[in-house]
Interface confidence: medium
């Protein structure tokens, strides 16, 4: 599973990330959620085959003939900067819900440069898909220096 | 059964470094999603998240007292372990080590360390 | 990065119901989890409620849990309250992968 470490939009605009997979996830479900802590994470987004499925401002979708699917995150606002993941592949782990696959974005939201007028048609950031490791540092150091390494990592779901 | 024991040094003088080590069971740190973090508590005032480690060696700090913190684990003994460098009267507290779950964290009873010279 | 924060002291009666309250100051009280914990006198911190809302096996069911967008709030109500009651609370979230602390209610 691959994809981009960190995104960044302005606020007001629209922005979508492309995460690539394996033919073996094919058929798998795929997920968007916020990261709260290592093996935890809210605001599940869940699509399953090539459906489209809406959360709020969030859209998933799967593209499995070209092996990617898309999430689009509408209207952001500041309070949407956090730490996302993409995920494929679900599998028990210690009796709890865990992803086999998986990587975080950490998202930056800016303001918009012009706050006066009201805004356009809404702007959509170009889809990265940088090759990353499904293990190894995914994110560096954070600016506020809490974090030591930063591995792509796994979570349990509620 | 999950359970945690701290252990310290009890009193230790200013600008010495304290090693606090936490003995667990009932889980291991080489399976996936396992954690083990460090609380303390001053006495009679709150919590105060001072670090966690993963199951895959991922360290977390608290961002206030980073350069001070040293997480570290040792997983075929089923233990996880903090230094704090440079201690002051300001560290003296009870520090609990916890095991987050997604049922919220499983808490050791507590060592009280004093710093005092 | 936000603070969560507590009364200090919140006095009820025994058989009311009391309602202690978590305010986050920045950012949506719904965008991370929220855990509650009771701590009685010298003991260590047990977890009442967790992610949000829900009660771990053994937590009566007097305990409950929940989120008051309208006022960036997570609320842990206690129905029936009794003697044993009567203890430290605090709230806790996460933010990118730390923990945060409330300053802790304490309940008389």
């Known amino acids: 599973l691959h994809g981009p470490s960190t995104m960044s939009g302005s606020v007001g605009e629209s922005l979508s990330v492309s995460c690539r997979y394996e033919e073996k996830f094919k058929t798998k479900d795929k997920y968007w959620c916020r990261v709260s802590l290592k093996i935890l994470c809210k605001d599940i987004v869940k699509t399953s085959s090539s459906e489209e499925a809406r959360s709020g401002r969030v859209t998933i979708r799967d593209h499995p003939d070209n092996l990617t699917f898309t999430v689009t995150y509408e209207s952001l606002t500041l309070e949407d900067a956090d730490t996302y993941m993409c995920a494929v592949d679900i599998s028990l782990f210690d009796g709890s819900l865990g992803f086999d696959k998986y990587f975080k974005i950490e998202l930056s939201v800016v303001p918009s440069e012009d706050p006066v007028s009201s805004p356009g048609p809404t702007l959509e950031t170009p889809v990265v898909s940088t090759s990353l490791p499904t293990k190894g540092p995914a994110l560096g150091s954070n600016t506020e220096g809490h974090r030591e390494h930063d591995y792509s990592q796994g979570l349990r779901l509620p | 059964e999950v359970k945690l024991v701290e252990s310290g040094p009890g009193i230790l003088q200013p600008s010495q470094t304290l090693s606090l080590t936490c003995t667990f069971s009932?889980?291991?740190?080489?399976?996936?999603?396992?954690?083990v973090g460090w609380i303390r508590q001053p006495s009679g005032k709150g919590l105060e998240w001072l670090a966690n480690i993963w199951w895959d060696d991922d360290k977390y700090y608290n961002p206030s007292l980073k350069n001070r913190l040293t997480i570290s684990k040792d997983t075929s003994n089923n233990q996880a372990f903090l230094k704090i460098t440079n201690v002051d009267t300001a560290d003296t507290a009870t520090y609990y080590c916890?095991?987050?779950?997604?049922?919220?964290?499983?808490w050791g009873q507590g060592v009280m360390v004093t710093v005092s010279s | 990065q936000f603070v969560l924060t507590q009364p200090n002291s919140v006095s009820t009666n025994l058989g009311s119901t009391v309602k202690l309250s978590c305010k986050r100051s920045?950012?949506?009280?719904?965008?991370?989890?929220v855990n509650w914990y009771q701590q009685h006198e010298g003991r260590s911190p047990t977890t009442m409620i967790y992610?949000?809302?829900?009660?771990p096996d053994g937590v009566p069911d007097r305990f409950s849990g929940s989120i008051d967008r309208s006022s960036n709030s997570a609320l842990l109500t206690i129905n029936n309250v009794q003697t044993e009651d009567e203890a430290d609370y605090f709230c806790q979230s996460y933010s990118s992968g730390m923990y945060i602390f409330g300053g802790g209610t304490k309940l008389n």
């Open positions: 992610r949000d809302d829900k009660r």
């Open positions: 009932g889980f291991s740190l080489s399976t996936y999603g396992m954690g």
């Open positions: 916890a095991r987050p779950t997604t049922e919220g964290d499983y």
């Open positions: 920045t950012g949506n009280i719904g965008s991370n989890y």
